[in-house]
């Protein structure tokens, strides 16, 4: 059933999430900037077809529209999406020495955000079953594919975070 913004989510949790989203957005932007500056891969829209052929998935947030937000479903989709991006970022490992530290920080920040969401779901008694394993992740056959994949994963993640931020900000409104 839909739950409005006056739901049972503590303000401290929502503010922590908003903080974490902005931290990850900063990490993601730094990765995008380095991919652009180092490899001239600056326009994710030019790589969409390659993204289809590589099988880079999107994470849905269909349970999170502000007009008919389903709290349990939305938090679950947020967590599942973050779990998906952990796997996608893992698949990018070894992208290049220059990008390694930025990618490492992004990976950990995404994992920490997933922890925050799960922790809150657990406290509300709505924690989902633990995902046993990651689904099939894209296999990058070349350095170019991995870098192009990096551009697309960072772009997808940023879109996911923008929606997440809007949802969380909506929930945080008194």
């Amino acid at each position: 059933t839909p739950l409005g913004p006056a739901s049972s989510l503590p303000q401290s949790f929502l503010l922590k999430c908003l903080e974490q989203v902005r931290k990850i957005q900063g990490d993601g932007a730094a990765l995008q900037e380095k991919l652009c500056a180092t490899y001239k891969l600056c326009h994710p829209e030019e790589l969409v077809l390659l993204g289809h052929s590589l099988g880079i998935p999107w994470a849905p947030l269909s349970s999170c529209p502000s007009q008919a937000l389903q709290l349990a479903g939305c938090l679950s989709q947020l967590h599942s999406g973050l779990f998906l991006y952990q796997g996608l970022l893992q698949a990018l490992e070894g992208i290049s020495p220059e990008l390694g530290p930025t990618l490492d920080t992004l990976q950990l920040d995404v994992a920490d955000f997933a922890t925050t969401i799960w922790q809150q779901m657990e406290e509300l008694g709505m924690a989902p079953a633990l995902q046993p394993t990651q689904g099939a992740m894209p296999a990058f056959a070349s350095a170019f594919q991995r870098r192009a994949g990096g551009v697309l994963v960072a772009s997808h993640l940023q879109s996911f975070l923008e929606v997440s931020y809007r949802v969380l900000r909506h929930l945080a409104q008194p």
Partner: antibody, heavy 119, light 112 residues
Framework: QVHLQQSGAELARPGASVKMSCKAS????????MHWIKQRPGQGLEWIGY????????NYNQKFRDKATLTADKSSSTAYMQLSSLTSEDSAVYYC????????????WGQGTLVTVSA | DIVMTQAAFSNPVTLGTSASISCRSS???????????LYWYLQKPGQSPQLLIY???NLASGVPDRFSSSGSGTDFTLRISRVEAEDVGVYYC?????????FGGGTKLEIK
């Protein structure tokens, strides 16, 4: 309540390997990252790396990439660190600490495992 | 890597008076989200470290309000308003803005 129980002290020869454990209780183990930190006698703290048990992903401080191997067993809620090709420089106390964000980061530590490397 | 710098020893303090411990980072720890990713830990003799302060100025659960922390993006100060015997130990600052996480060398609180 959260508790991290580390394995006992290890005495090893130069060139040998050791594997220590950190058993977690009081929380859902796979959800949190587990970090490992080194402290040489009378010295400061050095971050070695972390394991994300939910996806089995480990990340290392470059300095320890060829020294440490981090693993986790979800069924027993235990994180492991193996140290290889031991030298006297590896003689230290090694701590596990639970990861997280904000007030959760390193809010819980194991009691430490002392590794002594001696011929 | 971000380098965290601390003096090895504090100025000796008398019990009941205030003490300050400083820390400097080689890069600003202030993120664009407004959070400063600076932490303080205390390691008492023979014990594991414990979290005191997170995100530069927030007191961790169970930490007495005698402890406070402030700073800019690169220079930080931990203050203990009324030092007690149980405060003795080594104080470490640490950053978690980016990997690898790094710690300062630690400052030993000296009692007169």
């Amino acid at each position: 309540q959260v508790h991290l129980q580390q394995s006992g002290a290890e005495l090893a020869r130069p060139g040998a390997s050791v594997k220590m454990s950190c058993k977690a209780s009081g929380y859902t183990f796979p959800i949190y990252t587990m970090h490992w930190i080194k402290q040489r006698p009378g010295q400061g703290l050095e971050w070695i790396g972390y394991i994300n048990p939910s996806i089995g992903y480990a990340n290392y401080n470059q300095k320890f990439r060829d020294k440490a191997t981090l693993t986790a067993d979800k069924s027993s809620s235990t994180a492991y660190m193996q140290l290889s090709s031991l030298t006297s420089e590896d003689s230290a106390v090694y701590y596990c600490a639970r990861g997280g964000y904000g007030d959760s980061l390193f809010a819980y530590w194991g009691q430490g495992t002392l590794v002594t490397v001696s011929a | 890597d971000i380098v965290m710098t601390q003096a090895a020893f504090s100025n000796p303090v008398t019990l009941g008076t205030s003490a300050s411990i400083s820390c400097r980072s080689s890069k600003s720890l202030l993120h664009s989200n407004g959070i400063t990713y600076l932490y303080w830990y205390l390691q008492k003799p023979g014990q594991s470290p414990q979290l005191l302060i997170y995100q530069m100025s927030n007191l961790a659960s169970g930490v007495p309000d005698r402890f406070s922390s402030s700073g800019s993006g690169t220079d930080f100060t931990l203050r203990i308003s009324r030092v007690e015997a149980e405060d003795v130990g080594v104080y470490y600052c640490a950053q978690n803005l980016e990997l690898p996480y790094t710690f300062g060398g630690g400052t030993k609180l000296e009692i007169k």
